[in-house]
Amino acid sequence: LNTTILTPNGNEDTTADFFLTTMPTDSLSVSTLPLPEVQCFVFNVEYMNCTWNSSSEPQPTNLTLHYWYKNSDNDKVQKCSHYLFSEEITSGCQLQKKEIHLYQTFVVQLQDPREPRRQATQMLKLQNLVIPWAPENLTLHKLSESQLELNWNNRFLNHCLEHLVQYRTDWDHSWTEQSVDYRHKFSLPSVDGQKRYTFRVRSRFNPLCGSAQHWSEWSHPIHWGSNTSKENPFLFALEA
């Protein structure tokens, strides 16, 4: 009988995001060695990488991956058609957009082809594993003598994302940060004209379309202040 281990992965819900099913450990044969955990991330809902630590195997092994969607029209078992490799050993699988169904339970199974009884199955909520691309095209507008407005673009639907803006001056040792909702607009009401400011933004697929914990990469920083051009006081967009 299979044993089922519930493993938290940082985005728990009232129903589990992640289940790991392994074979019983009646003896320490190769068939009972635990398989590595599979980690999946959906990049901007364009493609998904499911990867595992191939070096955790006692000897180089080309593990195989199968997947399906539980209780759905897409419940037919699919073989990975695009493996990722690390030193010529399988270490992941890439799925394309048409194979990603965010709101259905994704089941991924890793198997040792030399020992078919050695397999592990995980269930994932893909909407909690989306990582958007970093925000782009940061621009700063001077709304008044002391007020700045920061705008940016995302390569995804705005209403699915929340954002974190960080800013600091050259005099600061740490960043000041502010959460921003799907309207993706940030104002700094009090700017010191004698200081140089740096701003950056990152985004997350939360809370409307998913409950992702992982943020995008930071945007390229944008600067404002004492050593920027004074010719056009209304618009600066200087990327580092």
Partner: nanobody
Framework: QVQLQESGGGSVPAGGSLKLSCAAS????????MTWARQAPGKGLEWVST????????AYAASVEGRFTISRDNAKSTLYLQLNSLKTEDTAMYYC??????????PGQGTQVTVSS
């Protein structure tokens, strides 16, 4: 298969109100965010509002914020859109769609909202 049936549209004077409904079937309604979109005569499909699967988060287009309210009843697999303080520019066919409104799921038949001055 997925079925979405919108209702509740009609003709109202500017400043009036309507409540649209969308009855869903053929999929696990409570697992999906749901979206209202609209299409004015001669224009493209415009996103109006989206609600999270549990109803706990909502988002609105700037043009309707403060006037429209999206809600859902997962027990009845039904999506709603309350339209208040209607303007002539709200005249459109209103559609509900499964998901966050990425344009891929085919909308239902729609319900017509006409606002007269």
């Amino acid at each position: 298969q997925v079925q979405l049936q919108e209702s509740g549209g009609g003709s109202v004077p500017a400043g009036g109100s309507l409540k649209l409904s969308c009855a869903a079937s053929g999929f696990s309604f409570s697992s999906y965010p749901m979206t209202w979109a609209r299409q004015a005569p001669g224009k493209g499909l415009e996103w109006v509002s989206t609600i999270a699967s549990d109803g706990g988060s909502t988002a609105y287009a700037a043009s309707v914020e403060g006037r429209f309210t999206i809600s859902r009843d997962n027990a009845k697999s039904t999506l709603y859109l309350q339209l208040n303080s209607l303007k002539t520019e709200d005249t459109a066919m209103y559609y509900c769609t499964k998901g966050y409104g990425d344009g891929t799921p085919a909308p239902g038949q729609g319900t017509q909202v006409t606002v007269s001055s």
